[in-house]
Structures are given as structure tokens and as C-alpha cells.
Interface confidence: medium
């Protein structure tokens, strides 16, 4: 059976430590770098540009803008060449909650 | 070998020079020529992990791309009336 447009096989999930964590509360968005890079001297890029002053596993944006702050994020450790990428697009609002 | 994310009209598409591999998350629809995965409407908050198909020797050059949409379709504004 060949692959078709409207179907796809379930593939093995990657281990949780390789995933970014995205937390959104009000207008604040916090992106956490995957565990695989450890805790020391993390570098962040946004749309291939180095984010100055960001060296923690968490990258926090207090007033996230969907237009200006959505895009490609990457984090990596100096000791590990491999980068992890996240494409994030988020719409935020100050006084709202998300209901399922 | 990096997955690129494109938005056209109201939909989200992932593209590679080779083909897009879904690791987990939103299934998507494989479009002709296998280079593009249609993740559907962005208001449905597609999320998942994807990478470009590569040979074993080149797999280290094909990083994972996590996709995270949160379009707040189910967001409820809290004002004094809502809280009352």
C-alpha cells in the first residue's frame, strides 16, 4: 500500500526530553529548550539571528506579539553542535483563558 | 535539510527539498511530489514534530522541527461580567 494524500502512518514519538515546552499565560509566552542540551550556557536564535542576552533554558517574552514574535526559534548548547528548532505562532490576550 | 513552514490562505504547509517525515503530532496530508505536508487550517492549532527525509549519512543534517500553533480560537476574555 503506497502513501496517499489523506493518510499517514503513525510514527514512533521522540523522547520527551527532545521537545520544546511552550507555556502561555495572558500575554506572556515562555519557551523551554529541550532537556537534551542540559542547563549550561544555552544560546537562542530567532529567525536565524542570535537573541542577545538569552542564555537560560527558558526564553521568556512578557508581551508576546503574534506579528513580531512568531517565527522560527532554535536553541543549542556550546558543547553540542546540533540545534533544536521550533516554529511558533501564538495569539495572546491579556485577560483571557483558553477553554477546551 | 531544514523543514520550512509556509502559511497560505488559512492553511499551514511544511516543505522540504526531499520529503517531510512526521515524527509525531498532527498527521497532515501528503501533497504530490512528497515534498509538502498540508497540516490543515491554522485555527485548528496544528502541532507536532517533523523532519526532512535524509539518507543515514546525512540524517544528522536533518534537524527536528517542532511546530506549535496557538491561535486562541477557544479563548474567552475575562472581564468583570464574565467573572460575576
Amino acid at each position: 500500500q503506497d502513501e496517499d494524500f489523506k493518510a499517514s502512518d503513525d510514527l514512533t514519538s521522540i523522547s520527551p526530553e527532545k521537545r520544546f515546552k511552550v507555556s502561555i499565560s495572558g500575554t506572556e509566552v515562555v519557551v523551554t529548550c529541550p532537556d537534551v542540551f542540559g542547563y549550561d550556557n544555552i544560546k537562542w536564535e530567532k529567525n536565524d539571528n542570535l537573541v542577545e542576552g538569552a542564555s537560560n533554558r527558558e526564553l521568556s517574552q512578557k508581551e508576546f506579539s503574534e506579528v513580531d514574535d512568531s517565527g522560527y526559534y532554535a536553541c543549542y548548547a556550546d558543547s553540542i553542535k546540533e540545534k533544536s528548532y521550533l516554529y511558533l505562532r501564538a495569539r495572546v490576550c491579556a485577560n483571557c483563558i483558553e477553554v477546551n | 535539510f531544514k523543514v520550512s513552514v509556509e502559511e497560505l490562505e488559512d492553511r499551514v504547509f511544511l516543505s522540504c527539498n526531499t520529503s517531510v517525515l512526521r515524527i509525531e503530532g498532527t498527521m497532515g496530508i501528503q501533497l504530490p511530489h512528497s515534498r509538502t505536508l498540508d497540516l490543515g487550517k491554522r485555527i485548528l492549532d496544528p502541532r507536532g514534530i517533523y523532519r526532512c527525509n535524509a539518507t543515514e549519512e546525512q540524517s544528522d543534517k536533518a534537524p527536528y522541527m517542532q511546530v506549535y500553533y496557538r491561535m486562541c480560537q477557544n479563548c474567552v476574555e475575562l472581564n468583570s461580567a464574565t467573572l460575576a
Epitope: D4, F5 | L8, E9, T36
Partner: antibody, heavy 118, light 109 residues
Amino acid sequence: ELTLQESGPGLVKPSQTLSLTCGVSGGSVTRSHYWNWVRQRPGRGLEWMGYWTGSTNYNPAFQGRISITADTAKNQFSLQLRSMTTEDTAVYFCARETTIPTFFFDYWGQGTLVTVSS
Amino acid sequence: SYVLTQLPSKNVTLKQPAHITCGGDNIGSKSVHWYQQKLGQAPVLIIYYDSSRPTGIPERFSGANSGNTATLTISGALAEDEADYYCQVWDSGAKAWVFGEGTQLTVLR
């Protein structure tokens, strides 16, 4: 408005190579679209032959004797079909295929009849 | 490789509905395009992705696709709809476009 125009010989001898060109005006031959050749033998249906999009992809039925190239400077793409037989007598169409999100043949040439005969 | 089956010919009375079918193994899992080709002319796209109609194509043309059959429907056939109709899918296994053999529609006055 994009227009495609096939050109080439109307008559080819058996065992010879067919060379057809599709000139494009009102748009550019680039890698962002798929540039296809389709043929239709007399009284028969449409048969996809292959495309160029920077790289090429051919119908396995023609594999080994087909070549599609493009000259982006001249805004044209070409078909070469080797070892022609009378079975290759057909109307040959060039067609542009749209890219994401649609992928269908939106513009066609009017077709050129190629007869294989000695 | 993937095979699409169409009836060679179909007759329809003027202003009556016409249903042109295209059969294929689990075709409902694929996306189907339909082309109209009038005598001596190049094909024209009339339905894409099963049921979408390009700009300029009359509303009487519609499409559906499920199971092993895709269907092109002309709600009320006109004389100008007399043509050959071809279905098309992408065969992801062979990495090739596949056309049906075509159905010749005749509109009876």
C-alpha cells in the same frame, strides 16, 4: 495571462529523436512550478510524460528514452524523446503545474501533432 | 502502477444531470482533479481536489470522491458541455501523474 506554445517538427522518422520546445510568455519558467509534458495518441487519452522543476521526474513508461530540460534565460523548457516509433505519433502538450497548496495543471499549450513515419 | 477506470462514453439528455465516474483502488484516500477537453483543444481544469471549482467554471459542475469512486456531476448538461472528461490523481508510489482513459460525453437534444 500566461501562455504556453509548443514548437518542433511535425514529422519524425522512426528511430530518430523528437525534440520539442515549450515557450512561455506572461510568466517565468522557474523552479517554483512544475513544467510538464503530456501527450495524447490518436483516439486515446492523456498520458503524463514527466516534468522539470529544477530536478526532473519521468513517467516510468518513458524511462531511459526521455529527457526534459529548461532554459530559464530563454524562458522555455524542452522535451527529448529518443528511439521514436510509430506508437509515438501523438499530439504533445506542455503544461504548467501549480505549486502548494493546489498541484494541478492550470495552463496548457494548444498542443502540437507529431507524426512518426518513414 | 495506479489505474483509473472511466467508461468510454456517456449520453445525457439536454438539461438533465450527467454523472461521470472514475474508479480506482481506494481513490477516496487520494485527491482527484477533473479536466474537460473539447475536440481539437487543450484540456481545461474544471474540478480540483475532489470538489473545488476554479474561477470561471460554471456552478453546474461539481465533484465528489469516496471509497473506490470519484464522480463528476453536471447538474444540467448543456450542448457546450459535449467533450471528453478526464480524471487525474497523483500516484505517490510510482511518483507519477495518472489520467483516466477519459469519458466522451454526448448531449442529446
